[in-house]
């Protein structure tokens, strides 16, 4: 999936299986990613688990779990708030669109989470205070929390190089992260589809093009569009909303 | 073991985090260090066998000597609101205000800095 980190780095990751997205003293978010096509390096999120840890007089521990074709509007125990404590309403789930869009507000830690199902896969977005982001007990184990540190270098896909290949007259072959590029989406069509929803040619737009070229699944256009929309709602600095290609970054510049 | 509470109170009191204090801030920094030391001493009985406690004690000793702080002298109150430790070390609070981050934060400092993370597509 494509990842926008807390530090506004943008990456495309091929991380497969379960990975920690956020892990601090208050919250744990884990995603499970699966290949979008058999044999493909490109993966998308098929499962999401969020654990809100027990906190003071506010909330009991609550677990939220979403999977492909199952986006619940309640925690795993059936509740929609933080439990029986005085401040239980400082944690709330709101269903925005049944089966497609859920918002979780954790006021006690100043955090808002948006989970969507777009097509077959899930998207995730969060707004969180820096103080909460950095509230980590075991500093030495911070290495692989994707939102904080980004993806390991060996798990990143260079989609800018992929795009350069795609733009050239010959179809990308070995350079492609997908062994079979769907012929149904010529580069020009992918560009047109993405332009419709994402007029600014930023990295969300580039991600959209990449996704259409690798999968042929038009739902990924919506995934990029909603990711940008959620960013508009959740990002505190509107000037930083659109991220653009940087000139080649040194490897490891993410952390 | 409430050592994490001591840690977060110290970092919030010094607010510049890991940066060394400017020379005119040293007395205030030393006062915050003495408060930190007192806080860790108060947790000693229930934290003495844990790594976090020993790290804090050694860290305090190092900072005290680096900044030539005397062991005796004034202590300070934390300047900004800190999140109490979560999970293992629950702090009891009868005030529902603690359950509203922004209300609780604004009492003590400027608006918090927010960050955003997103994951989507393939």
């Amino acid at each position: 999936p494509h990842l926008r980190t807390f530090t506004d780095h943008f990456q495309t990751c091929k991380v497969q299986g379960a990975w920690p997205l956020i892990d601090n003293n208050y919250l744990n978010v884990q995603v499970t990613n699966t290949p979008v096509l058999p044999g493909s390096a490109a993966t998308a999120t098929s499962k999401l688990t969020i654990i809100f840890k027990n906190f003071q007089e506010c909330v009991d521990q609550k677990v939220y779990q979403a999977e492909m074709d199952e986006l619940p509007s309640a925690f795993a125990d059936g509740s929609k708030n933080g439990g029986d404590k005085h401040g239980a309403n400082s944690l709330k789930i709101t269903e925005k669109v049944s089966g497609q869009h859920v918002e979780i507000q954790a006021k006690y830690i100043g955090t808002t989470i948006v989970v969507r199902q777009v097509g077959r896969y899930l998207t995730f977005a969060v707004r969180m205070p820096e103080e909460v982001v950095n509230a980590v007990e075991d500093r030495d184990s911070q290495g692989l929390y994707l939102c904080l540190r980004g993806c390991p270098l060996n798990q990143q896909i260079d989609f800018q190089a992929f795009r350069a290949n795609a733009e050239s007259p010959r179809r990308p072959a070995a350079a492609s992260p997908s062994p079979v590029v769907p012929e149904t989406f010529p580069y020009e069509t992918a560009v047109a589809k993405c332009k419709e929803k994402l007029p600014v040619e930023d990295l969300y737009y580039q991600a959209c093009v990449f996704d259409l070229l690798t999968t042929g699944d038009v739902n990924f256009t919506l995934a990029a569009y909603y990711a940008l929309e959620d960013g508009k709602m959740l990002h505190s600095n509107k000037d930083k909303l659109h991220l653009f290609e940087r000139t080649r970054e040194l490897p490891g510049a993410v952390a | 073991c409430k050592i994490l509470k001591c840690n977060s109170e110290f970092w919030s009191a010094t607010s510049s985090g890991s940066h060394a204090p400017a020379s005119d801030d040293v007395p205030e920094f030393c006062a915050a260090l003495r408060t930190y030391a007192l806080c860790t001493r108060r947790t000693a009985r229930t934290c003495r066998g844990d790594l976090a406690y020993h790290s804090a004690v050694h860290g305090i000793e190092d900072l005290m000597s680096q900044h030539n702080c005397s062991k005796d002298g004034p202590t300070s109150q934390p300047r900004v609101r800190t999140l109490p430790p979560a999970g293992d070390s629950q702090e009891r609070s009868d005030s529902p205000e603690i359950c509203h981050y922004e209300k609780s934060f604004h009492k003590h400092s400027a608006a918090p800095n927010y960050t955003h993370c997103g994951l989507f597509g393939d």
Partner: antibody
Framework: EVQLVESGGGLVQPGGSLRLSCAAS????????MNWIRQAPGKGLEWIGM????????HYADSVKGRFTISRDNSKNTLYLQMNSLRAEDTAVYYC????????WGQGTMVTVSS | DVVLTQSPLSLPVTLGQPASISCRSS???????????LEWFQQRPGQSPRLLIY???SRFSGVPDRFSGSGSGTDFTLKISRVEAEDVGVYYC?????????FGQGTKLEIK
Amino acid sequence: EVQLVESGGGLVQPGGSLRLSCAASGFTFSYYGMNWIRQAPGKGLEWIGMIYYDSSEKHYADSVKGRFTISRDNSKNTLYLQMNSLRAEDTAVYYCAKGTTPDYWGQGTMVTVSS
Amino acid sequence: DVVLTQSPLSLPVTLGQPASISCRSSQSLEDSDGGTFLEWFQQRPGQSPRLLIYDVSSRFSGVPDRFSGSGSGTDFTLKISRVEAEDVGVYYCFQATHDPLTFGQGTKLEIK
């Protein structure tokens, strides 16, 4: 989720020895002090001793001093209790517990000292 | 050694009613830096002990707010505001201020 699993209990004759193990998971074992506590059948709880995160210090109850030794292997996430010169009054369920003062406990292992 | 004396040793309570357990220490549990280290544990029948309250009044993670602790010096109390069926078991106080660490003898709470 914090999990502590004790093992090594059983029947032993007075004067004999036994080594109990406690396998820890769900937390960073090497960061925490650990305790052993026991409970004789139908009786209350008795603290046996504790060990610091790095084994630098150990503290024992008077009733076991000189006979019991607590150790740990952080690379294996395991806590040990070596019990020598066992007596009938050492018959109990033995629990390991996380933290300098115990918060999470294991399910216990039964030690019976009898001839 | 510090001796902790609990009372009553047996406590029959009606469901929904409050309950109170006392723990008295043979010496003050306040240390020289002002900390008081008294904990309360619950042991349900056939189960391991579970931490309820630490540092006199701080409720541990996941403990319902009907449990509360109070006290200072040598006198401490555990209160259950409304007893529920799952509260049946033995309750122990425990001090960590002085070595060796010691437990009270336990109070058995049962439903009338």
